[in-house]
């Protein structure tokens, strides 16, 4: 039965894979900016909103210099998985008010899912150690009110925007080190 399988084959040009990931991330960043603006117009935010279940921002811009590729991709994937879960929850449990953000919210979810698959592919192409399977996350409690759903939407889109902005900067910096 042939030789044992070797390590994952590294793509001839991992920079091209990284470029593709940067493009997807940047596109999703613009989508998120535009959708957050739409949300603010429909439901103006009274100050900043937080959601305890959201990931904390991975890194300040100033600390980007110390980043290493495996750590960035693993952390980014974990954070984006959390945001995907939150967007799915928002669409399911956010209430009738947030239906006015469809189909954009659905498009955002699909593109977030696509970016996650791209990150997974990039990690395998770069022969990076694959993260262990994600432990089942505790279910998110439904918002206590319609306004609770709107506040959650502000927090989710705001946090996702910051995460993606950090991701674009980080990925571009890492590209220069490949």
């Amino acid at each position: 039965p042939g030789p044992p399988p070797g390590p994952p084959r590294v793509s001839p040009d991992p920079r091209a894979e990284l470029d593709s990931t940067v493009l997807l991330t940047r596109s999703l960043l613009a989508d998120t900016r535009q959708l957050a603006a739409q949300l603010r117009d429909k439901f103006p935010a009274d100050g900043d909103h937080n959601l305890d279940s959201l990931p904390t921002l991975a890194m300040s811009a100033g600390a980007l210099g110390a980043l290493q590729l495996p750590g960035v991709l693993t952390r980014l994937r974990a954070d984006l998985l959390s945001y995907l879960r939150h967007v799915q929850w928002l669409r399911r449990a956010g209430g009738s008010s947030l239906k006015t953000l469809e189909p954009e919210l659905g498009t955002l979810q699909a593109r977030l899912d696509r970016l996650l698959r791209r990150l997974q592919l990039l990690m395998s192409r770069l022969a990076l150690p694959q993260p262990p399977p994600d432990p089942p996350a505790p279910p998110l409690a439904p918002p206590s009110s319609a306004w609770g759903g709107i506040r959650a939407a502000h927090a989710i889109l705001g946090g996702l925007h910051l995460t993606l902005d950090w991701a674009v900067r980080g990925l571009l910096l890492l590209k220069t080190r490949l």
């Epitope: 470029d19 940067v22 493009l23 997807l24 596109s27 613009a30 535009q34 603010r40 117009d41 571009l172």
Partner: antibody
Amino acid sequence: EVQLVESGGGLVQPGGSLRLSCAASGFTFSSFGMHWVRQAPGKGLEWVAYITPGSNTIYYADTVKGRFTISRDNAKNSLYLQMNSLRAEDTAVYYCAREYSSYDEGFAYWGQGTLVTVSS
Amino acid sequence: EIVLTQSPATLSLSPGERATLSCSVSDLIPSQYLHWYQQKPGQAPRLLIYRTSNLASGIPARFSGSGSGTDFTLTISSLEPEDFAVYYCQQGVDVPFTFGQGTKLEIK
């Protein structure tokens, strides 16, 4: 037919103020984000500011931040640009522009522009 | 800030010739956020091509756009007298929104 007509330009001294207006017609003004873009004499285009349909998100170019204020009155189908602390380098033709579709932030339709001259 | 660099600064051609204008972007940008405008002397700019390759309403089919990543191109297959103007590329993926410095297409 989409129409955008700018007004309010003129000659102003350095440090002075001016308020530009843009009257919109031919579309549902309250559904579209709007921009101001400027062009110095003989130079290229420079984006100045953007405002969403409901005025709750506003972006400015660094060159005008803190000095210019974009605003709109959806009931009057009007866009405004309040320009304070004017400098010689603000001399330009100022255009208002409408985005292509809601929240896409594009520059699909343009007015004919109004000239602002900052000089002593 | 994303910087767009257009080349050449001036292009001298005759009617009937093919024109190729380039726009080089300092960072990778998705193709749906790159647009082209035409401006004639004393007139406002007008949208020519949006999302890299889509013709705006009323724009003749001799205009076309292509490109990806950091390199984008506007092509005019056979120049008509009314095509001599200044052309600008623009990115809308990132704030601040930025324009290239323009390419002046002049009659040879």
